[in-house]
Interface confidence: low
């Protein structure tokens, strides 16, 4: 409602159109529709968006016009349900259209597919892209939004507008350059990699909200914002957490117009209150809106205030601990988390949340005891092993990464995770292990004080990918257990898994290990994926194979590919040498 609180907006769609402007309105509606109907052709979505936009304009002109008072879910849902091919394209998703709001929107959300059956995006020649960009810039950029949104149905919509702005800037600059490819391709690679990372980070936020509830998300936000803004008062952090929770709840719920609007509001508030939030925001706040919001989200941690008192005084030594806890449990725990996090930028958010959970469990037990103070006096001692576990794990894995390099480190993780959860599909194991392996180059270069927040919070994002992909087609009780029991203990849960002794090895299939000359034309990355796919399959056939056995087979395989790619008759080489390799591998592994 407005400041004057006369009444709610007569027309929500007109309100959002006026707030966001036509360009952002159309882009956000396109993203919303593409995230819901992931298989629909681009042209169909553009038509739907244009119809919604024209309708919104009539409501701006006259808010009392017919249907202008309907909710955005009703308007958008009605529009999606006009798609003629809904039943044949989406099957049971069409049943959503028989429901009323809000159940209909919930139904659409449940049918979002994290792994849609869509062709891989192939990048055309630079000249082809530049011609398309110059011929119709608007369509070119809409196509970008559409292709990303349908493949990443939880992509943070206002951030996708920022990516599109950078995408446009790259083409505007590089299509005029002397060497278009040298200018454009690195920029597109950077956008692709950043986009994948952004999508995965947002997917964790949505999973946190949807699977573990608002309280879990708010706890995460208190910890992260307290690390980032350690000079801010608890009340200020609480306000930011409330606003941030609203923004992400809206985006994860498909309310993209409200989400973008509220995110702009939040960025504005933060910039107007920099003095009471952080000294690091100045540069961010001088940027235009999309850049500003992105910059704030990535801003470095402010310096910790000097002379912060010991935590023990308020949270252990005070005789009022149980009284304060009983009066307002979540506020007291929030203050504990805030005070601990602002003192520990060197801890991961998930570690801070584990400590807060341990503290909460201790108070629940001790505040009901005969002598509460005596009972909780040693609570901080319980934190030591919780802190040491990720520290040791990161130390060991960084040493292994430095010894092996990224590709071989990924292979070590592939073997490790395939042995833990061999039922998981090979493409998922390859994707997840490759991403887990990237933690080395991403985080091991950092000094000790930055390693844990970098590594463990990144691993949370990657393991969430495993969880959402596995949820679509569950095959392993162990994965389900680690994914659903505790959000903050997912990584320790997976780390603790040993080889699955109940697994019945996969039948040997020579076809899986048959390769052709097309492997020679692949990029280095795609060739690695082929080899890593073969490695996972080997482990599934022979889960008890030793590291040495697997290394020998993989070395033979690499030599075989190199030899045949240099041969004159590549296809014959792959056929003949391939048979020899399979026989040798079977012998080496005792298959």
């Amino acid at each position: 409602r407005g400041v004057f609180r006369r009444d709610a907006h007569k027309s929500e769609v007109a309100h959002r159109f006026k707030d966001l402007g036509e360009e952002n309105f159309k882009a956000l509606v396109l993203i919303a529709f593409a995230q819901y109907l992931q298989q629909c052709p681009f042209e169909d979505h553009v038509k739907l968006v244009n119809e919604v936009t024209e309708f919104a304009k009539t409501c701006v002109a006259d808010e009392s016009a017919e249907n202008c008072d309907k909710s955005l879910h009703t308007l958008f849902g009605d529009k999606l349900c006009t798609v003629a091919t809904l039943r044949e394209t989406y099957g049971e998703m069409a049943d959503c259209c028989a429901k009323q709001e809000p159940e209909r929107n919930e139904c659409f959300l449940q049918h979002k597919d994290d792994n849609p059956n869509l062709p891989r995006l192939v990048r055309p020649e630079v000249d082809v892209m530049c011609t398309a960009f110059h011929d119709n810039e608007e369509t070119f950029l809409k196509k970008y939004l559409y292709e990303i949104a349908r493949r990443h149905p939880y992509f943070y919509a206002p951030e996708l507008l920022f990516f599109a702005k950078r995408y446009k800037a790259a083409f505007t600059e590089c299509c005029q350059a002397a060497d278009k490819a040298a200018c454009l391709l690195p920029k597109l690679d950077e956008l692709r990699d950043e986009g994948k990372a952004s999508s995965a980070k947002q997917r964790l936020k949505c999973a946190s909200l949807q699977k573990f509830g608002e309280r879990a998300f708010k706890a995460w936000a208190v910890a992260r914002l307290s690390q980032r803004f350690p000079k801010a008062e608890f009340a200020e952090v609480s306000k930011l957490v409330t606003d941030l929770t609203k923004v992400h709840t809206e985006c994860c719920h498909g309310d993209l117009l409200e989400c973008a609007d509220d995110r702009a509001d939040l960025a504005k508030y933060i910039c107007e209150n920099q003095d009471s939030i952080s000294s690091k925001l100045k540069e961010c706040c001088e940027k235009p809106l999309l850049e500003k919001s992105h910059c704030i989200a990535e801003v470095e941690n402010d310096e910790m205030p000097a002379d912060l008192p010991s935590l023990a005084a308020d949270f252990v030594e005070s005789k009022d601990v149980c009284k304060n806890y009983a009066e307002a449990k979540d506020v007291f725990l929030g203050m504990f988390l805030y005070e601990y996090a602002r003192r520990h930028p060197d801890y991961s958010v998930v570690l801070l949340l584990r400590l807060a959970k341990t503290y909460e469990t201790t108070l629940e037990k001790c505040c009901a005891a005969a002598d509460p103070h005596e009972c909780y006096a040693k609570v901080f001692d319980e934190f030591k092993p919780l802190v040491e576990e990720p520290q040791n794990l990161i130390k060991q894995n960084c040493e292994l990464f430095e010894q092996l390099g990224e590709y071989k480190f990924q292979n070590a993780l592939l073997v490790r995770y395939t042995k833990k959860v061999p039922q998981v599909s090979t493409p998922t194991l390859v994707e997840v292990s490759r991403n887990l392996g990237k933690v080395g180059s991403k985080c091991c270069k950092h000094p000790e004080a930055k390693r844990m927040p970098c590594a463990e919070d990144y691993l949370s994002v990657v393991l969430n990918q495993l969880c959402v992909l596995h949820e679509k087609t569950p095959v392993s009780d162990r994965v389900t257990k680690c994914c659903t029991e505790s959000l903050v203990n997912r990584r320790p849960c997976f780390s603790a898994l040993e080889v699955d002794e109940t697994y019945v090895p996969k039948e040997f299939n020579a076809e899986t290990f048959t390769f052709h000359a097309d492997i020679c034309t692949l990029s280095e990355k795609e060739r690695q994926i082929k080899k890593q796919t073969a490695l996972v399959e080997l482990v599934k056939h022979k889960p008890k194979a030793t590291k040495e056995q697997l290394k020998a087979v993989m070395d033979d395989f690499a030599a075989f590919v190199e030899k045949c790619c240099k041969a004159d008759d590549k296809e014959t080489c792959f056929a003949e040498e391939g048979k020899k390799l399979v026989a040798a591998s079977q012998a080496a592994l005792g298959l």
Epitope: R1, G2, V3, F4, R5, R6, D7, H9, K10, H15, K18, D19, L20, D261, A264, D265, K268
Partner: nanobody
Framework: EVQLVESGGGLVQPGGSLRLSCAAS????????MAWYRQAPGKQREFVSR???????NYPDSVKGRFTISRDNSKNTLYLQMNSLRAEDTAVYYC?????????WGQGTLVTVSS
């Protein structure tokens, strides 16, 4: 569109008080936030105070404790009570409003603090 008209400016001595008013008309139901800004001669426009849709207010340190923003819903009017005025508060004061950011502006009212 939203129309905003400020009033209440004038000459006041250091340490004195003034109350500025801003009357809003037009599509005011779309307004989520209202604010006061000021611009001294030869200087950039500066944020003075804001009241959001929820009634929360904020001020920069330069006016905190001296200025108070408030509103009267029944009259669609925004106020700025200015106490302990200083010479450096001399400026044209603008009322601003909008759904997300302050996109509608008044013409301004001049406040001069001088002995």
């Amino acid at each position: 569109e939203v129309q905003l008209v400020e009033s209440g400016g004038g000459l006041v001595q250091p340490g004195g008080s003034l109350r500025l008013s801003c009357a809003a008309s037009g599509s005011i139901e779309s307004i989520n936030r209202m604010a006061w800004y000021r611009q001294a001669p030869g200087k950039q426009r500066e944020f003075v105070s804001r009241i959001s849709k929820g009634g929360s207010t904020n001020y920069p340190d330069s006016v905190k404790g001296r200025f108070t923003i408030s509103r009267d819903n029944s009259k669609n009017t925004l106020y700025l009570q200015m106490n302990s005025l200083r010479a450096e508060d001399t400026a044209v004061y603008y009322c601003a409003a909008g759904p997300v950011w302050e996109q509608f502006w008044g013409q301004g009212t001049l406040v001069t603090v001088s002995s």
